[in-house]
């Protein structure tokens, strides 16, 4: 077979599997006169042999792990042993077989992990080696956790990266590991070659002992701070501590208060920086954040609660400059005249706001002083000594001292003596007949006017009339307003009438005075009146259970996901058909029968959130009346927008030749949501070939500087590719191009010959 197993002397490469006993020759070299014999030199390792006639073979199995390539030379000699051809290189590549098992570098590993550590963050690596070729499956290693001890509720607290051997916590491990319950764990880890995919793979195991350490990053107990402190500020009130020294601490005021009176130092001690006022704000909730040396949060923020303790720094206040009460002539001793209710801004139900009432002066003192008494704690005024006579003294003025434990305030009360209430209100009609109304009569409509009269002293509590519906309106659909001058009562609709629940209502009114009747006089039938309300049916539109329905979903939900539902009922009990109106983006569909709303297309928060559509509920049959409600779909952000340049950067230029390295600043943005910290982009050059000419350095989370590394640039446009990573979950990267022109400048602007007008740079650096 000329060519495959034999041929002239020329450079050749052969591939032979290791571990195989020789079964055939490698090659038969043919001699060209004057050559008569062949000679083999190089890395023969006494394995490779050439017979004088040119037969190249090997005499025992090869081992790739000893030598993966044998570099040989073959020369052709004449009869005198002089080289007449060659030597030419002959390369023997030894192909790998899986003849080595992986072995861990250590039979036992030890590590520690802190409770609540970030899931997926490696805290320990196990390492195995395999002498086989890593470019083939033979040397590709696959790590696995065989067992975790103890295993609680069948939950794995640890995970391993199959390729790197990095051990980290699972989400459950991050949440549930607790050194108080279980301070240590043991993992048995296996490593397999063949990428773990073959039954014939070799394996090894190792043991990993893991100590769980306590996480001291815990929210402190709520703090109580006395208001109006006169101690020198700042005052330490509590502390937080990261698990290691060196954390950078800061406070975050989620409430965005105009005045935030707290600070934290770099030890983690939290201070109040100025006196607090409970009456302005009685409690604060804010967050302590620990960051690493690069300003990245080390863990979740801790909630700090501060309760402001009350001191008695507010005096009682009167309800009004003068409080007016009425008392009838001949009222009996002990009768209540009225209650004076003073206020105190200090904390309710404490000694600081607990008030005492005392009468300090009565004028006139006719027929005597001490006609009134006030209940010390309740503030209720009572008649103390005798009945009063209007013709003797129609009005009394009382000065009342209201005090808490430290402050006293004077309040003024005017008591008007009025006629005795010995006349009852009398309705001009005892029956106002029937009134028929449609059930859709407007709320606020006056539907009936009623009138009673009272012969007692005009414009006093004895003659004033209050109307009450005492029967026939348990739903409170009606109300009665009284005109204080005429005592006319106006019956109004307060809530919608409803044929379906109350077609006929027998209403009973009672007319009464705010003042009590004198002893022996009672309200009788004259103070009662009735009327019958008949409600007629109107075919009403369906009624939604809410004016606005709201739902919240992630913007990346699968098509066909239920995103919300609406409900409506028809007052007449007809079936309802639901439909959507204003679904301008064609994202949603509604189940006509159930009111369930589903996505029918990919959602996009960046196109607008909340997405507002109208839902329509229509009667099936009947008059097909419909009503409309709003459905607001709040789309929660996922990181689905790569960073991009914040604006158009065409027109950047440097004047050529550069006298010194220059730089320019550019800004990145993306359309995703950036809560709390704002964007945190990282910037790098888009390809390695740019490294010699350019350098990109981060200024902050949104801005970076592009600098030249030297001054030797050609006079032309360079397109610099910048890679911007948003560090999100998952991280997205955008590659953007900044076109930078190096051009001859005239008075600081790019010079272009006439006719060359395209893309003139406009920004010089």
């Amino acid at each position: 077979q000329e060519g495959k197993f034999s041929g002239p002397l020329k450079p050749m490469t052969f591939s032979i599997y290791e571990g195989q006993e020789p079964s055939q020759i490698i090659f038969q070299f043919k001699a060209n006169p004057p050559a008569v014999t062949f000679e083999l030199t190089g890395e023969t390792d006494n394995i490779f042999v050439i017979e004088r006639e040119g037969l190249l073979y090997y005499n025992r199995a090869l081992d790739r792990e000893t030598r993966s390539t044998h570099n040989l030379q073959v020369a052709a000699l004449d009869a005198n042993g002089i080289i007449v051809e060659g030597p030419v290189p002959i390369t023997i590549k030894v192909k790998d077989i899986n003849d080595n098992r992986p072995t861990f570098l250590q039979s036992k590993y030890e590590g520690s992990v802190r409770q609540n550590s970030r899931p997926g963050k490696p805290f320990l690596y196990v390492n195995a080696t395999d002498l086989d070729d890593p470019a083939t499956p033979n040397g590709q290693l696959y790590y696995q956790i065989v067992i975790q001890l103890p295993m609680i509720n069948n939950v794995m607290y640890f995970q391993i990266n199959n390729k790197t051997g990095a051990i980290s916590l699972t989400r459950e491990g991050s949440q549930e590991l607790n050194p108080a319950k279980n301070p240590s764990y043991n993992l048995v880890i296996s490593v397999k070659d063949m990428g773990g995919q073959s039954e014939n793979s070799f394996s090894d195991t190792t043991s990993v002992d893991i100590i769980v350490t306590e996480n001291i990053w815990k929210a402190p107990k709520p703090v109580e701070m006395v208001e109006n402190s006169t101690d020198p500020h700042p005052i330490k009130i509590t502390q937080v501590r990261w698990n290691d020294p060196g954390a950078q601490y800061s406070l975050v005021d989620k409430e965005k208060l105009p005045r935030f009176p707290f600070s934290i130092d770099q030890e983690g001690d939290i201070y109040v920086t100025q006196p607090l006022d409970r009456e302005e704000k009685d409690a604060y909730v804010f967050y302590a954040v620990a960051k690493d040396e690069y300003g990245k949060p080390l863990s979740y923020p801790l909630e700090i609660h501060v309760k402001v303790k009350d001191i008695n720094d507010n005096p009682p206040t009167c309800p009004s400059p003068v409080t007016v009460f009425e008392v009838q002539e001949n009222e009996r001793l002990g009768n209540s005249i009225g209650t004076l209710t003073a206020h105190d801004r200090d904390e309710e139900n404490t000694a600081n706001s607990f008030l005492n009432y005392r009468i300090v002066e009565q004028t006139p003192k006719l027929p005597m002083d001490g006609l009134f008494l006030i209940q010390t704690y309740a503030g209720m005024l009572q008649l103390a000594k005798q009945s009063l006579k209007k013709q003797d003294t129609p009005q009394y003025n009382l000065t009342i001292e209201v005090s808490d434990k430290d402050f006293k305030t004077l309040c003024f009360v005017q008591i008007n003596v009025i006629d005795i209430n010995d006349q009852i209100p009398i309705f001009e009609k005892s029956d106002y007949g029937n009134l028929t109304l449609a059930e859709d009569t407007n709320i606020g409509s006056t539907i009936l006017t009623i009138q009673a009269t009272d012969a007692d002293e005009p414009f006093t509590g004895s003659s004033k009339i209050l109307y009450h519906i005492i029967k026939g309106d348990s739903e409170g659909r009606l109300g009665v307003d009284t005109d204080p001058h005429t005592n006319t009562g106006y019956v109004i609709i307060k809530k919608p009438l409803d044929f379906e629940t109350a077609a006929v209502s027998n209403i009973v009114f009672k007319a009464e005075n705010p003042e009590p009747l004198v002893f022996g006089v009672k309200y009788n039938a004259s103070s009662f009146a009735k009327f019958t309300l008949i409600v007629t049916d109107v075919n009403e539109a369906p009624q939604f259970s809410q004016h606005v329905f709201q739902a919240k979903v992630s913007e990346d939900v699968a098509i066909g996901t239920k995103v919300g539902n609406v409900t409506a009922k028809d007052p007449e009990g007809l079936d309802i058909s639901y439909s959507l109106r204003g679904d301008t983006r064609g994202w949603l569909k509604i189940d006509h029968v159930t009111g369930e709303i589903f996505s029918v297309a990919p959602l996009d928060r960046e196109a607008g959130s909340p997405y507002r559509v109208q839902v329509v509920a229509t009667e099936v049959g009947g008059s097909s009346l419909s009503s409309v409600s709003e459905f607001h779909l709040i789309l929660m952000d996922v990181n689905d927008n790569p960073p991009r340049l914040a604006k158009d950067y065409t027109g950047l230029f440097f004047c050529h030749p550069l006298s010194a390295p220059g730089s320019l600043i550019f800004e990145a943005t993306d359309d995703d949501q950036h809560l709390f910290r704002g964007p945190h982009f990282t910037f790098s050059l888009g390809s390695g070939s740019l490294q010699n000419d350019w350098e990109v350095s981060k200024i902050n989370g949104t801005h970076a500087r592009l600098s030249t590394r030297h001054t030797e640039f050609e006079e032309r446009e360079y397109v610099v590719l910048i890679r911007i990573n948003d560090g999100g979950r998952p991280p997205l990267e955008g590659i953007v191009s900044l076109p930078v022109t190096f051009c001859s400048c005239v008075e600081g602007s790019c010079f272009r010959p006439a006719g060359h007008q395209t893309g003139i740079p406009t920004v010089g650096m």
Partner: antibody, heavy 121, light 113 residues
Framework: QVQLQQSGAELVRPGASVTLSCKAS????????MHWVKQTPVHGLEWIGG????????VYNLRFKDKAILTADKSSSTAYMELRSLTSEDSAVYYC??????????????WGQGTLVSVSA | DIGMSQSPSSLAVSVGEKVTMSCKSS????????????LAWYQQKPGQSPKLLIY???TRESGVPDRFTGSGSGTDFTLTINSVKAEDLAVYYC?????????FGGGTKLEIK
């Protein structure tokens, strides 16, 4: 296993700049910050600064703030240190080093083999 | 900056002997919140990179022989090698991990008689 492979020795002229590289393997590059340490017979070991590939954040020893610029290329898992305006005082072996676990206060568990920088006219 | 000083600067011992070396810091490296001392010891053999031996003042790094022991608290620390072997010939450095900038001691050179 974790390996930090540093670039070869450099002979540079006074006033010039040089960029040293440190290629990381055996772990996720963005999970750990990379630090640089200078060693001379006179001053022993001196910490220069650290770079966090995830956030591109830096922390420097003030003594080296104007001397060294730390950067990294995530795509190639390589950290860089540029030394500027070199003088004979900058002749030293420079090491890149990585913490053993993610913490503010971890020691340096993994070290590169070092790069010798010689500044000479 | 936290200053670190080591003593002696060098010492020579015979194989099998016990050796101690000292490291002092200009301020305490004890973090009271977890009672750990943030001090590390490194070994640098001739022509090699430093290698971590001890962290938290007394915790041996995985794979470090138990003849190496770290002790001390606050500002005074000691590295003890119990029965010196020829392979322990090296310079030993302490380093504080308490605050930035990280600082190293000047080193103690261990020579074998």
């Amino acid at each position: 296993q974790v390996q930090l492979q540093q670039s070869g020795a450099e002979l540079v002229r006074p006033g010039a700049s040089v960029t040293l590289s440190c290629k990381a393997s055996g772990y996720t590059f963005t999970d750990y910050d990379m630090h640089w340490v200078k060693q001379t017979p006179v001053h022993g070991l001196e910490w220069i600064g650290g770079f966090d590939p995830e956030s591109a954040g830096t922390v420097y020893n003030l003594r080296f703030k104007d001397k060294a610029i730390l950067t990294a290329d995530k795509s190639s898992s390589t950290a860089y240190m540029e030394l500027r305006s070199l003088t004979s005082e900058d002749s030293a072996v420079y090491y890149c080093a990585r913490k053993g676990y993610y913490s503010v206060s971890s020691p340096f568990t993994y070290w590169g083999q070092g790069t010798l920088v010689s500044v000479s006219a | 900056d936290i200053g670190m000083s080591q003593s002696p600067s060098s010492l020579a011992v015979s194989v099998g002997e016990k050796v101690t070396m000292s490291c002092k810091s200009s301020q305490s490296l004890l973090y009271s919140s977890n009672q750990k001392n943030y001090l590390a010891w490194y070994q640098q053999k001739p022509g090699q990179s430093p290698k971590l031996l001890i962290y938290w003042a007394s915790t041996r790094e995985s794979g470090v022989p138990d003849r190496f022991t770290g002790s001390g608290s606050g500002t005074d620390f000691t590295l003890t090698i119990n029965s010196v072997k020829a392979e322990d010939l090296a310079v030993y450095y302490c380093q504080q991990c308490y605050s930035y900038p990280r600082t190293f001691g000047g080193g103690t050179k261990l020579e074998i008689k």
